[in-house]
Interface confidence: low
């Protein structure tokens, strides 16, 4: 009895010294990547942010608060994660891509258009899962139709063609607030990832009744966070297989 | 319906504070940002300032350090507080639905209310 | 500062006739289309009338036409009719929460 007892002690020991050399090497790779982070933002420690402010500084779309809505419940929740999913299994990732101005795009019939998307290296176009664009429709007067376009720019044609249809929806809206809208572009994203020469960026038109466009494309100063956006899910397939 | 209503004193004595308050309905202050123009008598508009629908605050330079800007969204309200007011400041102060210059803002205005500075 | 000027000061035409006012800006507006149009009668706020520099705002009439960008800008009125009579004011927006406008133009009908 005293033996089984001992050998179980020494099991149970056994395994929670490979816990804890587990623990401290997922802590100590996080460790790693925070400082990387921090020395690429030229940052001596992490900036105490609270998700109130990171409410203000992204977009007010729902993927985000769902996002940090999330975020809020992982940090409250103290109990010990399993390694499992971390380590093991296939993840999927959400990546926000917010426009960048081109060039390109600056000079189309002199005005300003939206948007040109670049692309982390993590996103490839074999693991994206799903890609959606968010666009903020400011609020309607009255009851109307919008028409919603999505074009995707492309290099002058000989007849001056310089856009190409993506998607386009109706959509009716009622007077209140503004709404978010996705698209999915799924196909184009992955299209541009296989051709990046390709990606000369969108233009986005919602256009009620009277031609009046409602789409936000370059926020205004009181119109913080309604930026257009990608939402990516990209999957990340295991790396290792259970020993 | 959409409306903006400026209310406030109509006299104000030199040195004083005047707190002008614009009241709207069918709009939703969380979604809509609010400017102030104002206009003294036979003259230009004058752009003032903004609230943004964030609550961020913009002010014309020479209003800064007189002005403030805050709302009340639960009570539709937006006030606009400036402060050591002049005889030069005496104008129709006027509030507006988005911001004049940016996309379709300054597309509905209240009727302006005329403010006096005058011992 | 900003100055935004517009000329001429008083524009006086008969009715039918073709008006051009403009308006240049000490810089360049933001994305060089922040520049809106009002229209503005003695007692009353102002109306828009054109946005983004050369759109029309809702409800006005098609006779009324914006183009420009950058610095320069004009505001056209094809045909004029007796009721455009009305002080025609300019405002530009300047990115980082600048905004400016106009001193504005007189439009008389003889």
């Known amino acids: 009895n005293e033996n089984s007892e001992q050998k179980e002690n020494v099991e149970k020991e056994g395994l929670c010294n490979a816990c804890t050399w587990r623990q401290n090497t997922k802590s100590s790779r996080i460790e790693a990547i925070k400082i990387q982070i921090l020395s690429k933002l030229r940052l001596e420690t992490a900036p105490n942010i609270s998700k109130d402010v990171i409410r203000q500084l992204l977009p007010k779309a729902p993927p985000l608060r769902e996002l940090i809505d999330q975020y809020d419940v992982q940090r409250d929740d103290s109990s010990d994660g399993s390694l499992e999913d971390d380590d093991y299994h296939a993840t999927t990732e959400t990546i926000i891509t917010m426009p960048t101005e081109s060039d390109f795009l600056m000079q189309v019939d002199g005005k300003p258009k939206c948007c040109f998307f670049k692309f982390s290296s993590k996103i490839q176009y074999n693991k994206v899962v799903k890609a959606q664009l968010w666009i903020y429709l400011r609020p309607v007067e009255t009851p109307t139709t919008v028409f919603v376009q999505i074009l995707r720019l492309i290099k002058p044609m000989k007849d001056g063609t310089r856009y190409t249809g993506i998607r386009s929806l109706k959509l009716d809206m009622n007077p209140g607030t503004g709404i978010w809208q996705s698209i999915d572009v799924k196909t184009v994203l992955q299209n541009w990832l296989k051709q990046p020469e390709s990606n000369l960026g969108i233009e986005i038109k919602a256009l009620d009744e009277n031609g009046h466009d409602l789409a936000v494309t370059f926020p205004g100063p009181g119109e913080d966070g309604l930026n257009p956006f990608l939402e990516v899910k990209v999957t990340d397939t295991p790396k290792r297989s259970r020993r | 319906q959409v409306t903006l209503k400026e209310s406030g004193p109509v006299l104000v004595k030199p040195t004083e504070t005047l707190t002008l308050t614009c009241t709207v309905s069918?709009?939703?202050?969380?979604?809509?940002?609010i400017s102030w123009v104002r206009q003294a008598p036979g003259k230009g508009l004058e752009w003032v300032g903004i609230i943004s629908y964030a609550g961020k605050k913009y002010y014309a330079s020479w209003a800064k350090g007189r002005l403030t800007i805050s709302k009340d969204t639960s009570k539709n309200q937006v006030v606009l507080t400036m402060t050591n007011m002049d005889p030069v400041d005496t104008a129709t102060y006027y509030c507006?639905?988005?911001?004049?210059?940016?996309?379709?803002?300054?597309?509905?205005w209240g009727q302006g209310t005329l403010v006096t500075v005058s011992s | 500062d900003i100055v935004m000027t517009q000329s001429p000061a008083t524009l006086s035409l008969s009715p039918g006739e073709r008006a051009t006012l403009s308006c240049t800006s000490s810089?360049?507006?933001?994305?060089?289309?922040?520049l809106s149009w009002f229209q503005q009668k003695p007692g009353q706020p102002p109306k828009l009338l054109i946005y983004w520099a050369s759109t029309l705002a809702y409800g006005v009439p098609s006779r009324f036409s914006g183009s420009g960008s950058g610095t320069d800008f004009t505001l056209t009125i094809s045909s004029l009719q007796p009721e455009d009579a009305a002080t025609y004011y300019c405002a530009g927006g300047y990115g980082g929460g600048r905004y400016a406008f106009g001193q504005g133009t007189k439009v008389e009908i003889k």
């Open positions: 069918g709009i939703d202050l969380s979604h809509t940002d």
């Open positions: 507006a639905r988005g911001v004049p210059a940016y996309s379709h803002g300054g597309d509905l």
């Open positions: 810089q360049s507006v933001y994305h060089a289309n922040w």
